[in-house]
Amino acid sequence: ENSTSPLSADPPVAAAVVSHFNDCPDSHTQFCFHGTCRFLVQEDKPACVCASGYVGARCEHADLLAVVAASQKKQ
């Protein structure tokens, strides 16, 4: 499952602002660690749509708040 918030770039770009994007090229299959690569047309650069539970420009960090929230839900 992909969360469109945040759509991580460098600097971060709010998902609502980014309406125009393309698929990233094949060369970028490893650009995002835990998420999907999207090529931002206006900025002319790749960015990452992080999978649920991950944050960071490349979705490289586990979202500790999400982890805590998920564990509290289970209890």
Partner: antibody, heavy 115, light 106 residues
Amino acid sequence: VQLQQSGAELVRPGASVKLSCTASGFNIKDDYMHWVKQRPEQGLEWIGRIDPANGHTKYAPKFQDKATITADTSSNTAYLQFSSLTSEDTAVYYCTRMGLRRGYWGQGTTLTVSS
Amino acid sequence: IQMTQSSSSLSVSLGDRVTITCKASEHINSWLAWYQQKPGNAPRLLISGATNLKTGVPSRFSGSASGKDYTLSITSLQTEDVATYYCQQYWGTPWTFGGGTKLEIK
């Protein structure tokens, strides 16, 4: 917005050399940085790339043991280092980053390997 | 991915409409660039993304795409356009370049 490369190099066979490419107007962490080779009177050949955000590299097989690409994000600079140089390495080397709407190429660095 | 420029050289006249073609061995989804190179100079990027003209490049240059076939057109050839033209795919790694098409005046 540009890529500025280091000056021409004349080196002896067997020596090593390190070429630099400094970006201005954009952050090299935004996307991969690539290096391309062009021998005199020849076509263009991809050497490899680096992801400056994490240092991950990928090389064309023929350059795997010859070239090393590195980056320093604090100076916004990518590097191409060669070891055990031979006359076959005499060429112009370009650093580049390509997008869908725009592309950036350095002016090229001429490397001459001669005794 | 192989990039094939069918003509290594073209004999042209000033004022001609010139078409240079490039064929990809696989789909590259318009991740294609065109370059102009003159002897002793660095390649000059003309077009990226198959159709996007780089700022400062004359409007007589244009790019088009159809499937795996890509075309660079020059509407009315000028003296300064005499050069070698290369296509390049940057969809996948390794990046690959066409062999070049050299324009020569008749």
